[in-house]
């Protein structure tokens, strides 16, 4: 008698489960070679493909660059070869692995291709305030395709100290509810830190003039 | 800020060679590709060759690739271009350049190369 | 090798014109085209890279576009200082290749 394969206790057959996949957020850089990590288990072997902002893709296919594939895997590395490379990958990439029990699919994971950190010359002109008033200091950081972060130092490389009245909003500006004196300083500077790169790039320094108004002198 | 700043340039004779240098600072060096692009006097652009600071990998424009030779040496954060078997033609100003993804987004201040024959 | 051609080698113009320069493919470069500002005995800057995007720090009166073999920059209104030689450059297949230039001047 011949027991059909999915009977036999050592070959039930199993659906596509993913066991391994890249992070949702993939950044590389021009020199990065690209890698994508697609593993799943299931019986019998799974197939697996691959789309790009929901187009076949096929790495190998690709023209131009040396594609390593692993066996038995969804995972693949694209090696870049010039300097031009790393932006055409850019896109949403979703792995699907199948077998004849159904499909299991990846994550969606955003590939982004970061350029060279860039802020822009500026002749930075002197803020200029009264004693009470609110003020916002602008930090405007470069943009960046992973997440930075974001800190305000004078030029002796201090922090500035932060409290209920100087706080740094989400956009990295740094947001004075009311200005005194004390805060009159020509050295606020905002630093981006990006740590995929361990960069710091840092912004020019703004000049911050505290004008004492008379009714501040008065209720001196 | 990203600076690159050239040195190695001058005067050599038909069939000698010459090292061009080009250090880099302000941005970390092995995320981002080097180039070489060169004019000559009262001519275009044109690109000689281009390096992987992370991996070495090279490519060249094919009309040098027997004379010029890109590298780099990560320690120093410095590009070069040994240039061998010179001619009169490749008198031109030498840029280094650092490729952003898309373009060549910073450039050095350029380096006169003037071969005598 | 992909020949970058454009077709005109100075162009005068005024300050506050509108200035548009063209750039020709030899075939098709999928946008990736860039354009460089060169002033004498300078080295030349990126002012727009991928047709359209504007290189950090330079002014908005820049401006590319185009797709295919066909790309133009435009400059809406000239400022003294935006007299210079422009390049355009493709960088979608080895070897990149830039166009000849073309000079703007000073009517």
């Known amino acids: 008698i011949q027991i059909p394969e999915e009977y036999e206790g050592h070959h039930v057959m199993e659906p596509p489960v993913i066991t391994e996949q890249s992070p949702r957020r993939l950044v590389v850089f021009p020199t990065d070679d690209i890698s994508l990590k697609c593993e799943a288990s299931g019986k019998p072997e799974v197939q697996f493909r691959w789309t790009r902002d929901g187009v076949h893709f096929k790495p190998k296919e690709e023209l131009g660059v040396t594609v390593y594939q692993s066996p038995h895997s969804g995972s693949f590395t694209i090696t870049g070869n010039n300097s031009n490379f790393a932006q055409r990958f850019q896109g949403i990439y979703r792995c699907f692995a199948s077998n004849k029990l159904g499909t299991a699919m990846s994550h969606e994971i955003r590939l982004m291709a970061e350029g060279a950190p860039k802020w822009p010359k500026e002749t930075v002109k002197p803020v200029e305030v009264e004693e009470g008033e609110s003020v916002v200091l602008p930090c405007n950081p470069p943009p960046s395709a992973e997440p930075l972060r974001i800190y305000w130092m004078n030029s002796k490389i201090l922090h500035i100290k932060q409290d209920e009245r100087v706080t740094m909003g989400q956009n990295g500006n740094l947001y004075f509810a009311n200005v005194l004196t004390s805060d009159n300083h020509s050295d606020y500077i905002c630093h981006a830190h990006f740590p995929g790169t361990r960069t710091i790039i840092q912004k020019e320094p703004i000049d911050l003039r505290v004008k004492a108004t008379n009714s501040m002198i008065d209720r001196k | 800020e990203v600076q690159l700043v050239q040195s190695g340039g001058g005067l050599v004779q038909s069939g000698g060679s010459l090292r061009l240098s080009c250090r880099a600072s302000?941005?970390?060096?092995?995320?981002?590709?080097m180039l070489w692009v060169r004019q000559r006097p009262g001519k275009g652009l044109e690109w000689v060759a281009e390096i992987n600071p992370r991996n070495d990998r090279t490519n060249y424009n094919e009309k040098f690739k027997t004379r010029f030779t890109i590298s780099v040496d990560r320690s120093k954060n410095t590009l070069y271009l040994q240039m061998d078997s010179l001619r009169a033609e490749d008198t031109a100003v030498y840029f280094c350049?650092?490729?952003?993804?898309?373009?060549?987004?910073?450039w050095g201040q350029g380096t006169l190369v003037t071969v005598s024959s | 090798d992909i020949q970058m051609t454009q077709s005109f080698s100075s162009l005068s113009a005024s300050v506050g014109d509108r200035v548009t320069i063209t750039c020709r493919a030899s075939q098709d470069i999928s946008n990736y085209l860039n354009w460089y500002q060169q002033k004498p005995g300078k080295a030349p800057k990126l002012l727009i890279y991928y047709t359209s995007r504007l290189h950090s720090g330079v002014p908005s009166r820049f401006s590319g576009s185009g797709s295919g073999t066909d790309y133009t920059l435009t400059i809406s209104s000239l400022q003294p200082e935006d007299f210079a030689t422009y390049f355009c450059?493709?960088?979608?297949?080895?070897?990149?290749?830039f166009g000849g230039g073309t000079k703007l001047e000073i009517k």
């Open positions: 450059q493709q960088g979608n297949t080895l070897p990149w290749t």
């Open positions: 350049a650092l490729g952003g993804g898309y373009a060549m987004d910073y």
């Open positions: 302000g941005y970390t060096f092995t995320r981002y590709w």
